[in-house]
C-alpha cells in the first residue's frame, strides 16, 4: 500500500561542478523499519524484470555494508525517519533524478529527488523593493539556491564595485522545506545613488570569485536643485537688478512644476527657471530659495539671503520709560531701519546737539528734571545719513520743589488774632493736587494752599505745609511767634520755708509761666493798695498786721494778668488778753457771773488758765469761767493766761466785786 | 559685440575742468552700471566714480570725492565723467567700464572696457 | 587689496594668483601693456566672459579669491590687477600681480 510511505525534501536541488549537494530528506514507513536502501541516477521501471535500472550510486543491503567507491555518495539516514543524502563532490554529469529505492519488510518505495548541476557556479539572484525612494530604508536581498555543509560560500555586497559599509546578514537553509543561501542589506539609498549599480557576488571560503548579480538602482527622488545669484554675493542697493537661477542637477521622476519663495512664502507668477527682480527695493531683502517639484515630492535649493542695502529710514526714539521719575535712569534707543546697520548716531535734546552721543542707546543714570524735552536722533550708515525723526518726549516727574509756607498777616501776631497761611511751591510734576499742614488743628481752608486759624492760641508755636502730588514736600516749619499777656501769674512764697511767725522775715514771688513780648512790669496789690513793682515781695519783720490777701499783677504790652488773690497768714502767741466780766464787774451775790478770757491769736487759743488775786490756777481751762450762784467770797482780782501752738500770752488782772444780796443784809 | 569708445582727453590746464564723454553700443545701454576707472604712467588701476543703471547711486573714488561728476544719458548710450580744478595727479588714461549688473559693484563686476582716452594736466 | 608682485610658470603648467583684503566680490583684469585696455578674465568671483578660454577660473574662500591659470600658455604672460569694492561700494583694485611664463 503506497500510502503508507511518506516522503519530505525538497523537490530540485541545484550545485556546480566541484562543489557538493545536500539533500535534506524524511520518511516514514508504517509498517516497519527501512532494510534497504539504493539511490539510482536516471532510474527507470523494467517492466520484464519488475525492477528499476540505473546507475546505483548508492547501495546499503541488510548487513549495513557499503562499497568503498560509494564514498562519494553517503546516505545520512536511518531506519525508520531520516533519508538525508549527501554528494561530494558533485559532477555537471549527476544532473538528472536521483530515486531513492526503499524497502521494508513488506513494501517498496521509488522517491524522485531532481538535481539540476551546471557546469560553473550559476549567479545569485537580487531582489528589489518595488519602489526605492531617496532616505527610506529599504532591504536588498541575495538569495541563491545553494547550501551545503562541506562547500562553504560567501555573498559580498558592491556599490560601484566598492563593498558596502553597511553590515549585511547572511542566513542559510538546509531543511526539508528549501535550501538557499541568502543575504540581506539594509540600506538608506539616497537620491545620488540613482542609477548606481548594485552587485552582490558570489565567493568560496576564500573570497575567490564564482558568479555575481547586479542590478542598476532606480532611486526615486525630489528635484534636487542649484540656486545661482547676480552678483553672486547678493548684495545689492536699492535699485539694482538681481537675478536668480535655478538648476535641475537630478530628478527622478521628471519634474513637474517650478516655483520661488521668499522667506517661505510662495512668489505669484514667478513659474520659471529665472527669477529676475529689477529695481529692487528694501522690503524684497529676504530669504529666497526656488522649489520644483515631481511624483515624489518638491524640492528646495539652498537658501539665499538677498541684501537690499539702503541709507538710514527717518529714525524715531524709544524711551524706557517715560515719565521717568527723578532720579531714576532712563535708556534712550534710537530706532531706524537700515541695512548695513547704522555705524553712528546723533542725538538731539530739545533740539540742540548731545556732545558725545554716538551710539544706538543713550543711558542716563539719573534723571533731574532738566533732561525733560524732545529727544531725537539721526543714523548713519555707510550708504549715508538718515533724516531725523519726530523725536519723543520724556517727562520728568518729581515732588514739588521749594516749598514754603507763608504768613500774609501783618506782624506782630497776637493771641485771639485770624491767621492765614499760605503753601507756595517753585515747581512741580505732576501738577500740585492737595496740602497738608502740620501740626494739625480744626482749621479751616478756604481755598487751596491756604490756611485760615481763627482766634490763635498763644501756643501756637510753629506751622509746616507740604505740598503734594504723587509725593508730599514739605516746607521748613515757619514760626507763628504769637504774641500775648504773661500767662500762669501767681503768688509764691520764698521764704519761710513752713509757716510765717510774727517777726519772720518773709519774701514773695510773683511768678507767671510764660510772656510774648519777655519784657514785663509787675504789680503788688493789698486790698486794692499798691504795694510795690518788683517781682519779689520782702517783709524784714511780718506783723500780724500784715496779714490779708495779695495779689500780684504781670503786664507786658499785650496786656496785664492778675494771680489769684493769695492769703498771708501770720502766726503769733496770744496777745491782748482781758478778762471781760458778764453781767459786770459788780455783781450781787447769789447771781450768775460769766468771766470771758479774750485774746487776739493765730492760730486761736487752745487752752485757757484761769488765776485768782492769789495767783492760784483755777480749775478751769474753757475760755468761759461760769461762775454760779456767785458768793461774796468770789470778789476779787482775776487774770487768764492763753495758749496756742506760738506761745503763751496774759492778760492783766481784773476785779469783780461780789456783794450781799438784800436778804443777805436783811438777815444781818 | 560690445564697445565703449571715450573721448574727451588731451591736454588740460591745472584748476581746470574736462570732460569725458563713452559712446556705448552692442548691449542695452539703460540695463547696466557704467563708469570709469582711470590709470597714471607707470601705476596701476585706479576707480574713479561709477553709476548705477537707474541712476540712483553714484560712486565716487576719494581722489576725485568733490570734484567729480557723473552722468548717463540712457536715450543717447552715453556716459559723462565731469571732473573739476584739475591736478597733476589727474594725469593719466581714462577707461570706460561696464558693470556685468545693472548695480554698481565698484571694481568686481566689471565686464568690458573701452580703449581709453589719455589725459595730461600740465601749465 | 594684496596680491603678490610677480608669479611664473613653464607653459603647461597650474598657476595661482592670489588676491586678499575684502570681504565682497572680486573680478580679475588682464593688461598686456601699460594704458592699454584691461581684459577681464573673471568677474564676480568666478563668473568667466564667453570669450575668455576656460583655463581661467576664479574661486574665493573667506576675503581670499584666487585667479587659477590651468595649463598656463605663452599668450597669458600679463599683468593681473584684482579688482572688488569697500563697504561703501566704491572700488579698489590691487597693485597688480606680473605673470612670466617660462
Known amino acids: 500500500d503506497s500510502s503508507k510511505w511518506v516522503f519530505e525534501h525538497p523537490e530540485t536541488l541545484y550545485a556546480w561542478e566541484g562543489a557538493c549537494v545536500w539533500i535534506p530528506c524524511t520518511y516514514r514507513a508504517l509498517d516497519g523499519d527501512l532494510e534497504s536502501f539504493i539511490l539510482f541516477h536516471n532510474p527507470e521501471y523494467n517492466k520484464n524484470t519488475s525492477k528499476f535500472d540505473g546507475t546505483r550510486l548508492y547501495e546499503s543491503t541488510k548487513d549495513g555494508k557499503v562499497p568503498s567507491e560509494q564514498k562519494r555518495v553517503q546516505f545520512l539516514g536511518d531506519k525508520n525517519k531520516n533519508c538525508t543524502l549527501s554528494i561530494h563532490p558533485v559532477h555537471l554529469n549527476d544532473s538528472g533524478q536521483l530515486g531513492l529505492r526503499m524497502e521494508s519488510k513488506t513494501e517498496k518505495w521509488m522517491e524522485r529527488i531532481h538535481l539540476n548541476v551546471s557546469e560553473r557556479p550559476f549567479p545569485p539572484h537580487i531582489q528589489l523593493p518595488p519602489e526605492i525612494q531617496e532616505s527610506q530604508e529599504v532591504t536588498l536581498t541575495c538569495l541563491l539556491n545553494f547550501s551545503c555543509y562541506g562547500y562553504p560560500i560567501q555573498l559580498q555586497w558592491l556599490l560601484e564595485g566598492v563593498p558596502m559599509r553597511q553590515a549585511a546578514v547572511t542566513s542559510t537553509s538546509l531543511t526539508i522545506k528549501s535550501v538557499f543561501t541568502r543575504s540581506e542589506l539594509k540600506f538608506s539609498p539616497q537620491w545620488s545613488h540613482h542609477g548606481k549599480i548594485v552587485t552582490c557576488q558570489l565567493q568560496d571560503a576564500d573570497g575567490k570569485f564564482l558568479s555575481n548579480d547586479t542590478v542598476q538602482l532606480n532611486v526615486k527622488h525630489t528635484p534636487k536643485l542649484e540656486i545661482k545669484v547676480t552678483p553672486s554675493d547678493a548684495i545689492v542697493r536699492e535699485g539694482d537688478s538681481v537675478t536668480m537661477t535655478c538648476e535641475v542637477s537630478s530628478s527622478n521622476p521628471e519634474y513637474t512644476t517650478v516655483s520661488w519663495l521668499k522667506d517661505g512664502t510662495s512668489l505669484k507668477k514667478q513659474n520659471t527657471f529665472t527669477l529676475n527682480l529689477r529695481e529692487v527695493t528694501k522690503d524684497q531683502s529676504g530669504k529666497y530659495c526656488c522649489q520644483v517639484s515631481n511624483d515624489v515630492g518638491p524640492g528646495r535649493s539652498e537658501e539665499v539671503f538677498l541684501q537690499v542695502q539702503y541709507a538710514p529710514e527717518p529714525s524715531t526714539v524709544q524711551i524706557l520709560h517715560s515719565p521717568a521719575v527723578e532720579g531714576s535712569q532712563v535708556e534712550f534707543l534710537c530706532m531706524s531701519l537700515a541695512n548695513p546697520l547704522p555705524t553712528n548716531y546723533t542725538w538731539y535734546h530739545n533740539g540742540k546737539e548731545m556732545q558725545g552721543r554716538t551710539e544706538e542707546k543713550v543711558h542716563i543714570p539719573k534723571i533731574l528734571p532738566w533732561h525733560a524735552g524732545t529727544y531725537s536722533c539721526v543714523a548713519e550708515n555707510i550708504l549715508g545719513t538718515g533724516q531725523r525723526g519726530p523725536g519723543a518726549e520724556l517727562d520728568v516727574q518729581y515732588p514739588p520743589k521749594k516749598v514754603t509756607t507763608v504768613i500774609q498777616n501783618p506782624m506782630p501776631i497776637r493771641e485771639g488774632d485770624t491767621v492765614t497761611l499760605s503753601c507756595n511751591y517753585n515747581s512741580s510734576n505732576p501738577s500740585v493736587t492737595r496740602y497738608e499742614w502740620k501740626p494739625h488743628g480744626a482749621w479751616e481752608e478756604p481755598s487751596l494752599g491756604v490756611l485760615k486759624i481763627q482766634n490763635v492760641g498763644w501756643d501756637n508755636t510753629t506751622i509746616a505745609c507740604a505740598a503734594c502730588n504723587s509725593w508730599c514736600s514739605w516746607a521748613s516749619p515757619v514760626a507763628l511767634n504769637v504774641q500775648y499777656a504773661p500767662r500762669d501769674v501767681r503768688v509764691r512764697k520764698i521764704k519761710p520755708l513752713s509757716e510765717i511767725h510774727s517777726g519772720n522775715s518773709v519774701s514773695l514771688q510773683c511768678d507767671f509761666s510764660s510772656s510774648h513780648p519777655k519784657e514785663v512790669q509787675f504789680f503788688w496789690e493789698k486790698n486794692g493798695r499798691l504795694l510795690g513793682k518788683e517781682s519779689q515781695l520782702n517783709f524784714d519783720s511780718i506783723s500780724p498786721e500784715d496779714a490779708g490777701s495779695y495779689s500780684c499783677w504781670v503786664n507786658n504790652s499785650i496786656g496785664q494778668t492778675a494771680s489769684k488773690a493769695w492769703t498771708l497768714e501770720v502766726l503769733y502767741a496770744p496777745r491782748r488778753l482781758r478778762v471781760s466780766m458778764s453781767p459786770g464787774d459788780q455783781v450781787m451775790e447769789g447771781k450768775s457771773a460769766t468771766l470771758t478770757c479774750e485774746s487776739d491769736a493765730n492760730p486761736p487759743v487752745s487752752h485757757y488758765t484761769w488765776f485768782d488775786w492769789n495767783n492760784q490756777s483755777l480749775p478751769y481751762h474753757s475760755q468761759k469761767l461760769r461762775l454760779e450762784p456767785v458768793k461774796v467770797q468770789h470778789s476779787g482780782a482775776y487774770w487768764c493766761q492763753g495758749t496756742n501752738s506760738v506761745g503763751k500770752g496774759r492778760s492783766p488782772l481784773s476785779t469783780l466785786t461780789v456783794y450781799y444780796s438784800p436778804e443777805t443784809i436783811g438777815r444781818r | 559685440a560690445v564697445t565703449l569708445d571715450e573721448s574727451g582727453g588731451g591736454l588740460q590746464t591745472p584748476g581746470g575742468g574736462l570732460s569725458l564723454v563713452c559712446k556705448a553700443s552692442g548691449f542695452s545701454f539703460s540695463d547696466y552700471g557704467m563708469g570709469w576707472v582711470r590709470q597714471a604712467p607707470g601705476k596701476g588701476l585706479e576707480f574713479v566714480a561709477f553709476?548705477?543703471?537707474?541712476?540712483?547711486?553714484?560712486d565716487y573714488g576719494a581722489a576725485v570725492k568733490g570734484r567729480a561728476t557723473i552722468s548717463r544719458d540712457n536715450g543717447q548710450s552715453t556716459l559723462r565723467l565731469q571732473l573739476n580744478n584739475l591736478r597733476a595727479e589727474d594725469t593719466g588714461t581714462y577707461f570706460c567700464a561696464k558693470s556685468a549688473y545693472g548695480g554698481s559693484y565698484g571694481s568686481s563686476s566689471i565686464d568690458a572696457w573701452g580703449h581709453g582716452t589719455e589725459v595730461i594736466v600740465s601749465s | 587689496l594684496t596680491q603678490p608682485s610677480s608669479v611664473s610658470a613653464n607653459p603647461g603648467e597650474t598657476v595661482k594668483i592670489t588676491c586678499s583684503g575684502s570681504n565682497n566680490t572680486y573680478g580679475w583684469y588682464q593688461q598686456k601693456a601699460p594704458g592699454s585696455a584691461p581684459v577681464t578674465v573673471i568677474y564676480d568671483n568666478t563668473n568667466r566672459p564667453s570669450d575668455i578660454p576656460s583655463r581661467f577660473s576664479g574661486s574665493k574662500s573667506g576675503s581670499t579669491n584666487t585667479l587659477t591659470i590651468t595649463g598656463v600658455q605663452a599668450e597669458d604672460e600679463a599683468v593681473y590687477f584684482c579688482g572688488s569694492r569697500d563697504s561703501t561700494y566704491v572700488g579698489i583694485f590691487g597693485a597688480g600681480t606680473t605673470l612670466t611664463v617660462l
Open positions: 553709476l548705477g543703471s537707474s541712476s540712483s547711486y553714484t
